[in-house]
C-alpha cells in the first residue's frame, strides 16, 4: 500500500523549491524499478515529484490566503511492466499559515459625530480590522487595538475596537478630532504586524451658549418721511453655537415704544428695526428703546446656560424732512350754477407747511381755463359755465411752498356745475308724415316725443299743444299722452292732394322747469293718394317709392 504522512508546506517560502515529504509504495525496495507520478491541479506547476524516490517538492511560492489546500493524485508504475503498482490515490497538501498579513481596516474612511460635552464613557464608534491570516493558527489573526493619537479625549477598548469619550470636549474650542487607531496581530507580541486607521470625530453642537449683543448701544436714524414698515437699521448678537442652536429671536422690551418693532432675519440672524408707526420730527425727534435677544430653541436641560437674556439700548434719531404742504382735506368738492358770470366764487381750499419754518403757500389749478385760484386758496370762475357742455370738472390743485418750490402737494378738486333751466324741449327727431286723401276723422297720423338738454331735479315732463293758428285750423288735432309723448290725429274726413298737397303743423312743447320754457316745432304732413285700402302704410310705401323715382300703376 501507499505510505505517507500528512503534507504541510509553509506559505511564502522564498526558496526556489521546498521539500514537502515523500509518497512511496511499501513495495518499493529502492532499486529504482518504480516510477512515481503526480496528477491534479498544481501538479507540474506548483508541485513536482521525484519520479524515482516519490519525494514531493513545492516549486512555487504559495499564498495560504489565496489557496490553503491542494488535492492531488499519485500514481506508482512498475517501469518494467508499465503497470500500476498501487491504485491511484488522492492526497492533500495543506498550506500552513505564517503571519504575513497585517490587520486592515476595511470600512474606511471612519467618521463619527458625537455631541459636545458628552460624558466620559460615551460610545463614539467601533472600528474593526480584519486580518487575512489563519485565525486557527496561533495568534496570527488575533488583534489588539490601541490609540496612537487622540488622548486624553478618547480611549479604545483593546479587544473590541470600541472608541469612547474619556474627557469632555467643547465644540466651541475645537470642533473635530483626528483619532489614530492601531490594530496589532499576534495579540501585540513581538513580530506582530500592525495596521492603522484614522477616525474623524466631529463634535455636534449643543445649545450651551446664549446669544450676546456685541454692542451695548446702537445709534440709528429714521427719516420722518419714512413709511411704516421701513427698515431703519440692524442690530446683531453673536452666538458661539451653530445651526439651529444659533438661531435667535430679537424683541423690544414690553414697556418700550409702540413706534418701533424688531423682526428677526433668520438667514442672517440679524435684528431688523422696523418703523411701526410714522414719526414726526416736529412732534418728537428722538426715541430710546431696549432690545433683547434669546435663542429660538433651548431644550429644558440646557436652560441653565440661558438664564439672563442679553440686552442692548437703541437710540433712534428722527431726521427732519422738508415736507410738502399739507391740505386740510384730502380732496375738495364744490358746486356752482351754470351761466354764473365770470369771476363768481366757487370755494376756498387751504394748505399749510407742516415744517417748523411755516413757509407761505402758493396755489395753482392745473390745466384749467375755466377756474382761477388766488394765493388765499379762493377759487373763482374765469368763464361762463354751461352744464350741458360739462357737468363736472375733475381738476388738480397744487400747493407749493414759497421758500422751496420743489415742495409740492396736489389734491383732487371736483366742481359740479348745477343746472338752470336754459333749454326748451324739442322734437326728439325730425318728423315728416303722410295722410291719405280718403283718411277719416280721428285717424292717428303720428306719435311724437321730445327731449330737453337740461337736467331735471324731478323727471322731465313735457306738455304738447298746437299753436294758436293751428288750433284754429281744424284739419288736425293733438292729444298729449301725459308720458312725454303726444299723437297727431286727423280732425276731418278727406283731403285733396291737388288742392292742398302738404300741411305744416306748429306744435308747442313746454317743459316743467321754473321758469318753464316752450319751443315751437314743425310737423310736415304730406297728402297722398292711397288707393282703395286707405292704409297709411300703403300710402307711406307709395310715397317712398315715388320719391325714389318709380312710377306705380
Amino acid at each position: 500500500g501507499w505510505v505517507w504522512n500528512q503534507f504541510f508546506v509553509p506559505e511564502e517560502m522564498n526558496t526556489t523549491s521546498h521539500h514537502i515529504g515523500q509518497l512511496r509504495s511499501d513495495l518499493d525496495n529502492g532499486n529504482n524499478s518504480f516510477q512515481y507520478k503526480l496528477l491534479g491541479a498544481g501538479a507540474g506547476s506548483t508541485f513536482i515529484i521525484d519520479e524515482r524516490t516519490g519525494d514531493i517538492y513545492a516549486i512555487q511560492k504559495l499564498d495560504r490566503e489565496e489557496r490553503s489546500l491542494y488535492i492531488l493524485r499519485a500514481q506508482v508504475i512498475d517501469i518494467a511492466t508499465g503497470r500500476a503498482v498501487e491504485p491511484e490515490s488522492e492526497f492533500v497538501i495543506k498550506v500552513s499559515d505564517i503571519n504575513d498579513n497585517e490587520p486592515k481596516f476595511l470600512d474606511e474612511p471612519y467618521e463619527a459625530i458625537v455631541p459636545e460635552m458628552s460624558p466620559e464613557g460615551t460610545l463614539v464608534i467601533q472600528v474593526t480590522a480584519s486580518d487575512a491570516d489563519d485565525p486557527s493558527s496561533g495568534n496570527n489573526a488575533r488583534l489588539l487595538y490601541s490609540l496612537l493619537q487622540g488622548q486624553p479625549y478618547f480611549s479604545v477598548e483593546p479587544t473590541t475596537g470600541v472608541i469612547r469619550i474619556s474627557s469632555k470636549m467643547d465644540r466651541e474650542l475645537q470642533d473635530e478630532y483626528w483619532v489614530i487607531i492601531q490594530a496589532k496581530d499576534m495579540i501585540g507580541q513581538p513580530g506582530a504586524l500592525s495596521g492603522t486607521t484614522s477616525v474623524l470625530i466631529k463634535l455636534s453642537d449643543v445649545n450651551d451658549n446664549k446669544p450676546i449683543f456685541k454692542e451695548s448701544l446702537y445709534r440709528l436714524t429714521v427719516s420722518e418721511s419714512a413709511p411704516t414698515g421701513t427698515s431703519i437699521g440692524t442690530i446683531m448678537a453673536y452666538d458661539n453655537d451653530i445651526g439651529e442652536n444659533a438661531e435667535m429671536d430679537y424683541s423690544i422690551e414690553e414697556d418700550d415704544s409702540q413706534t418701533f418693532d424688531i423682526i428677526t432675519n433668520h438667514e442672517t440672524q440679524e435684528g431688523i428695526v422696523i418703523l411701526k408707526k410714522k414719526v414726526d420730527f416736529e412732534h418728537q425727534n428722538h426715541y430710546g428703546i431696549r432690545a433683547k435677544v434669546k435663542n429660538h430653541h433651548v431644550p429644558e436641560q440646557l436652560m441653565k446656560y440661558h438664564t439672563e437674556a442679553s440686552t442692548t439700548f437703541i437710540k433712534i434719531q428722527v431726521e427732519d424732512v422738508d415736507e410738502p404742504p399739507l391740505f386740510l382735506l384730502p380732496y375738495y368738492v364744490f358746486e356752482v350754477f351754470e351761466e354764473t358770470p365770470q369771476g363768481s366764487f366757487v370755494g376756498v381750499v387751504s394748505a399749510t407747511d407742516p415744517d417748523n419754518r411755516k413757509s407761505p403757500i402758493r396755489y395753482s389749478i392745473t390745466r384749467s381755463k375755466v377756474f382761477n385760484i388766488n394765493d388765499n386758496g379762493t377759487i373763482t370762475t374765469s368763464n361762463s359755465l354751461d352744464r350741458e357742455i360739462s357737468a363736472w370738472y375733475n381738476l388738480s390743485i397744487t400747493a407749493t411752498e414759497k421758500y422751496n418750490i420743489e415742495q409740492i402737494s396736489s389734491i383732487p378738486l371736483y366742481v359740479q356745475v348745477l343746472n338752470i333751466n336754459d333749454h326748451a324741449p324739442e322734437f326728439s327727431q325730425y318728423y315728416e308724415t303722410y295722410v291719405c286723401e280718403n283718411a277719416g276723422s280721428g285717424q292717428v297720423i303720428q306719435t311724437i316725443s321730445a327731449v330737453d338738454r337740461d337736467e331735471s331735479i324731478e323727471e322731465h315732463h313735457f306738455y304738447f299743444n298746437l299753436s294758436v293758428e293751428d288750433t284754429n285750423n281744424s284739419s288736425f288735432t293733438i292729444i298729449d299722452n301725459q308720458d312725454n309723448t303726444a299723437v297727431i290725429l286727423t280732425n276731418r274726413t278727406g283731403f285733396n292732394l291737388q288742392e292742398e298737397p302738404v300741411f305744416y303743423i306748429s306744435i308747442l312743447i313746454a317743459d316743467n322747469g321754473i321758469p318753464s320754457l316752450t319751443s315751437t316745432n314743425t310737423l310736415t304732413i304730406h297728402v297722398c293718394d292711397c288707393g282703395d285700402s286707405g292704409s297709411t302704410q300703403t300710402c307711406q310705401y307709395q310715397e317712398l317709392v315715388l320719391s325714389m323715382g318709380f312710377k306705380t300703376e
Partner: antibody, heavy 121, light 107 residues
Framework: QVQLLESGGGLVQPGGSLRLSCAAS????????MNWVRQAPGKGLEWVST????????YYAESVKGRFTISRDNSKSTLYLQMNSLRAEDTAVYHC??????????????WGQGTTVTVSS | EIVMTQSPVTLSLSLGERATLSCRAS??????LAWFQQKPGQAPRLLIY???TRATGIPARFSGSGSGTEFTLTISSLEPEDFAVYYC?????????FGGGTKVEIK
C-alpha cells in the same frame, strides 16, 4: 542521450531585437524546467531566466526584466528567449540548460554549447 | 540577492595533488548548491548538486561537502583533464547566482 542545440544568435545594433531558440531531444521536455545562462567574453557565468515545465512559472534576472521574455513550446520541445531593447552589455554566449529532478528541479544538469549574441553599432 | 564568493581565484597544483575549492554564500542556502566544471570553448558540466550528490557519470575523486553558508569541492587526486575553471551556484533563492569561479591550473 540528452541534447540541447541553441540557435538565433548574431550581430545586432543597440536597441534591436533577437529571438534565441533551443531545440531539446532525448528527454520528456514538458517534465523539466529550462534555463538560459549567459557568459560574457572572458567573464563568469550569469543566470538570465528560468521557466517551469508547464510554462506557468517564469523568473528573470533583474538586468533583463522587462526586456527579455522566456517561453516554451512543449509540442515542439523548444525553448525560446525573445530579447528586445538590446544593449552592449548583453553581448555574450547564451547557453540553454535543462533542469533536474526533485529538489534539483530548478537546477542545470545538462547544458547546450551556446549561441553568440553581439550587440554593437 | 545571494552573493556567492569563491576562493581562491586561482589554484596552482601538480598532477595527483589534492585540490580544495571553497565557496561561501552571503546567507544560508541549506544544501541547495551545485558545482560546475568549464573548460575553454566548452559548455559547463554539472559535477555536484545538493551540496554533495555527484551527477551521473562524475568520477568518485570529486566530492562536495558543507551546508548553510560554507561549502567545499574536493578533488582527491588531480588528473590531467581536471585542469579547468570551477563554478559554484546556489539554487535555493531567486535570482539564481554563480560564484566568480576558481581556476585550477597545472603548477
Amino acid at each position: 542521450q540528452v541534447q540541447l542545440l541553441e540557435s538565433g544568435g548574431g550581430l545586432v545594433q543597440p536597441g534591436g531585437s533577437l529571438r534565441l531558440s533551443c531545440a531539446a531531444s532525448g528527454f520528456t521536455f514538458s517534465s523539466y524546467a529550462m534555463n538560459w545562462v549567459r557568459q560574457a567574453p572572458g567573464k563568469g557565468l550569469e543566470w538570465v531566466s528560468t521557466i517551469s515545465g508547464g510554462g506557468a512559472n517564469t523568473y528573470y534576472a533583474e538586468s533583463v526584466k522587462g526586456r527579455f521574455t522566456i517561453s516554451r513550446d512543449n509540442s515542439k520541445s523548444t525553448l525560446y528567449l525573445q530579447m528586445n531593447s538590446l544593449r552592449a552589455e548583453d553581448t555574450a554566449v547564451y547557453h540553454c540548460a535543462k533542469g533536474g529532478m526533485g529538489g534539483y528541479y530548478y537546477g542545470m544538469d545538462v547544458w547546450g554549447q551556446g549561441t553568440t549574441v553581439t550587440v554593437s553599432s | 540577492e545571494i552573493v556567492m564568493t569563491q576562493s581562491p581565484v586561482t589554484l596552482s597544483l601538480s598532477l595527483g595533488e589534492r585540490a580544495t575549492l571553497s565557496c561561501r554564500a552571503s546567507q544560508s542556502i541549506s544544501s541547495n548548491l551545485a558545482w560546475f566544471q568549464q573548460k575553454p570553448g566548452q559548455a559547463p558540466r554539472l559535477l555536484i548538486y545538493g551540496a554533495f550528490t555527484r551527477a551521473t557519470g562524475i568520477p568518485a575523486r570529486f566530492s562536495g561537502s558543507g551546508s548553510g553558508t560554507e561549502f567545499t569541492l574536493t578533488i582527491s587526486s588531480l588528473e590531467p583533464e581536471d585542469f579547468a575553471v570551477y563554478y559554484c551556484q546556489q539554487y535555493n533563492y531567486w535570482p539564481l547566482t554563480f560564484g566568480g569561479g576558481t581556476k585550477v591550473e597545472i603548477k
